[in-house]
């Protein structure tokens, strides 16, 4: 009888992660008597995958009944394949022997390649908020995919971005890969409702790319503009002064009124109105009793927005005459003022 040959008909097998791999192996003879074993890799460091004789291999099932002497089909199925299972598998026939079974003949090997889907892309923005006109960086990461070929695109509100850098690691052969990309985005005042999207396309996704998003509302800070105005007289000795805080984001804002540099009242923005672009407006007013002042009064609206240094606008009230309806729109920042009083 011709000497036994071990035949592995498939040079390679491609399997999607999570599925079952079938590794085929047949022998051409029933002799010699002895077990079949499957290994991943060759040489001294090879990993035992299945031993017909002994051991527990919960992920492995045999295609045919290997317990029977007349069996010559030694194919196995490996369940729940992961990228870590990739490699070359060898079907090896042993001859029954003492003290140990002796390796008799090996198959040529079957390379198992695993197609694994990338994980959902995770997009993260800068740790601190930034203001319009500043450039911020966003990162996108996805892991665990195989094969290595992958495409990554960035979008802002549906418009593809071009200023980004992408790396796929590792550079050499691996069971699975990771992608890391950094995109630069210039912020505008209208970006509160904007989204940055990272899109990953891979052969395992069958044309349906994965997307990760970041809302620029988590990244942007739109500083407020202030306007202090004097309203018509309410009573003979009272003046109503308003501070309009416009176009700010996020909502966290504290306003302090100062009369001649002394704190008169502090309040936190609560009932704000939202603009279409996602920014907020808020108005605070101060009722000033003119008769309580002998000299002119300098009123300052001081706003601390989102933990940033305070900005302010001032308005001068003269007490020498009864004030009439007047408006003030001072352009000076911080404690500066630009008087325009009408009597």
């Amino acid at each position: 009888e011709e000497e036994l040959q071990v035949i592995q008909p498939d040079k390679s097998v491609l399997v999607a992660a999570g599925e079952t791999a079938t590794l085929r192996c047949t022998a051409t003879s029933l002799i010699p008597v002895g077990p079949i074993q499957w290994f991943r890799g060759a040489g001294p460091g090879r990993e035992l995958i299945y031993n017909q004789k002994e051991g527990h291999f919960p992920r492995v099932t045999t295609v045919s009944d290997l317990t029977k002497r007349n069996n010559m089909d030694f194919s196995i199925r490996i369940g729940n394949i992961t990228p870590a299972d990739a490699g070359t598998y060898y079907c090896v026939k042993f001859r029954k022997g003492s003290p140990d079974d002796v390796e008799f003949k090996s198959g040529a090997g079957t390379e198992l390649s695993v197609r694994a889907k990338p994980s959902a892309p995770v997009v993260s923005g800068p740790a601190a908020r930034a203001t319009p006109q500043h450039t911020v960086s966003f990162t996108c990461e996805s892991h665990g995919f195989s094969p290595r070929d992958i495409t990554l695109k960035w979008f802002k509100n549906g418009n593809e971005l071009s200023d980004f850098q992408t790396n796929v690691d590792p550079v050499g052969e691996s069971v699975s890969y990771s992608i890391h990309s950094t995109a630069k985005v210039v912020l505008t005042r209208e970006d509160v409702h904007s989204q940055v999207i990272c899109e990953v396309a891979h052969v395992t996704l069958q044309g349906d790319p994965l997307r990760g998003t970041a809302n620029l509302s988590e990244t942007i800070r739109v500083p407020p503009t202030l306007e202090v105005t004097q309203q018509p007289v309410r009573a003979e000795n009272q003046v109503n002064v308003t501070c309009q805080v416009r176009k700010f984001y996020p909502q966290r804002l504290q306003l302090t009124w100062l009369e001649n540099g002394n704190v008169s009242r502090t309040e936190t923005a609560s009932t704000v109105t939202e603009n279409k672009d996602g920014t907020y407006n808020w108005m605070s007013w101060l009722l000033v009793n003119v008769s309580a002042h002998r000299d002119d009064v300098k009123l300052t609206c001081q706003v601390e927005h989102d933990g940033q240094p305070a900005v302010s606008k001032s308005h001068d009230l003269k007490v020498s005459a009864h004030p009439k309806e007047q408006g003030s729109n001072t352009a000076a920042e911080n404690t500066g003022s630009n008087e325009r009083n009408i009597y």
Epitope: L66, K68, R69, P99
Partner: antibody, heavy 118, light 107 residues
Framework: EVQLVESGGGLVQPGGSLRLSCAAS????????MHWVRQGTGKGLEWVSA???????YYPGSVKGRFTISRENAKNSLFLQMNSLRAGDTAVYYC????????????WGQGTMVTVSS | DIQMTQSPSSLSASVGDRVTITCRAS??????LAWFQQKPGKAPKSLIY???SLQSGVPSKFSGSGSGTDYTLTISSLQPEDFATYYC?????????FGQGTKLEIK
């Protein structure tokens, strides 16, 4: 149904010969190693002979040169030719199939009695 | 030749008992050990092969273990039909050899 049926046993004088047969059915006979095992009255089991799928044969020292195992795959039959019989060969002779991958016996016949006596 | 020594040679037990029979080989047999059950006037019946693999159709109350030279057969809960003679056999190398048998009797 997988079955082994022995025949050919009987009374024989010391120095005589006997040919035992084992008829196999219910499986592909040619694909299995086959064995003969005997058991003396009130005694334990003793392996007597084996034949592989390729016709290779094996014997213990106690019967070597006297017993010959053979097979006829076309007729699904196993044979044991016993020559120069001795009183110590008196036993029930069983044929057994090396039915497991490792040649462990999985199926046994019901046995045939061989008595060597003058 | 490899000698197989079984112990005990006889054993009395009750229904429901758990019993263990041991078999020692004169040299390593690489787990190529089988266990058989035989009742009077009947052919042996295969129970276990390769030291611990259960033959098809054999109830799981029978289990085998061991390696090297020392092997055991355990019957977890004896039933009346389990009272018989048990043999071990090495088939690692020719000539195949059997133990002398263990007769399991009802106490």
């Amino acid at each position: 149904e997988v079955q082994l049926v022995e025949s050919g046993g009987g009374l024989v004088q010391p120095g005589g010969s006997l040919r035992l047969s084992c008829a196999a059915s219910g499986f592909t006979f040619s694909s299995y190693d086959m064995h003969w095992v005997r058991q003396g009255t009130g005694k334990g089991l003793e392996w007597v002979s084996a034949i592989g799928t390729a016709g290779d044969t094996y014997y213990p020292g106690s019967v070597k040169g006297r017993f010959t195992i053979s097979r006829e795959n076309a007729k699904n039959s196993l044979f044991l030719q016993m020559n120069s019989l001795r009183a110590g060969d008196t036993a029930v002779y069983y044929c057994a199939r090396g039915g497991n991958w490792d040649d462990a016996f999985d199926i046994w016949g019901q046995g045939t009695m061989v008595t060597v006596s003058s | 030749d490899i000698q197989m020594t079984q112990s005990p040679s006889s054993l009395s037990a009750s229904v429901g008992d758990r019993v263990t029979i041991t078999c020692r080989a004169s040299q390593g047999i690489n787990n190529y050990l089988a266990w058989f059950q035989q009742k009077p006037g009947k052919a042996p019946k295969s129970l276990i092969y390769t030291a611990s693999s259960l033959q098809s159709g054999v109830p799981s109350k029978f289990s085998g273990s061991g390696s090297g030279t020392d092997y055991t057969l355990t019957i977890s809960s004896l039933q009346p039909e389990d009272f018989a003679t048990y043999y071990c056999q090495q088939y690692n190398s020719y000539p195949y050899t059997f133990g002398q048998g263990t007769k399991l009797e009802i106490k």
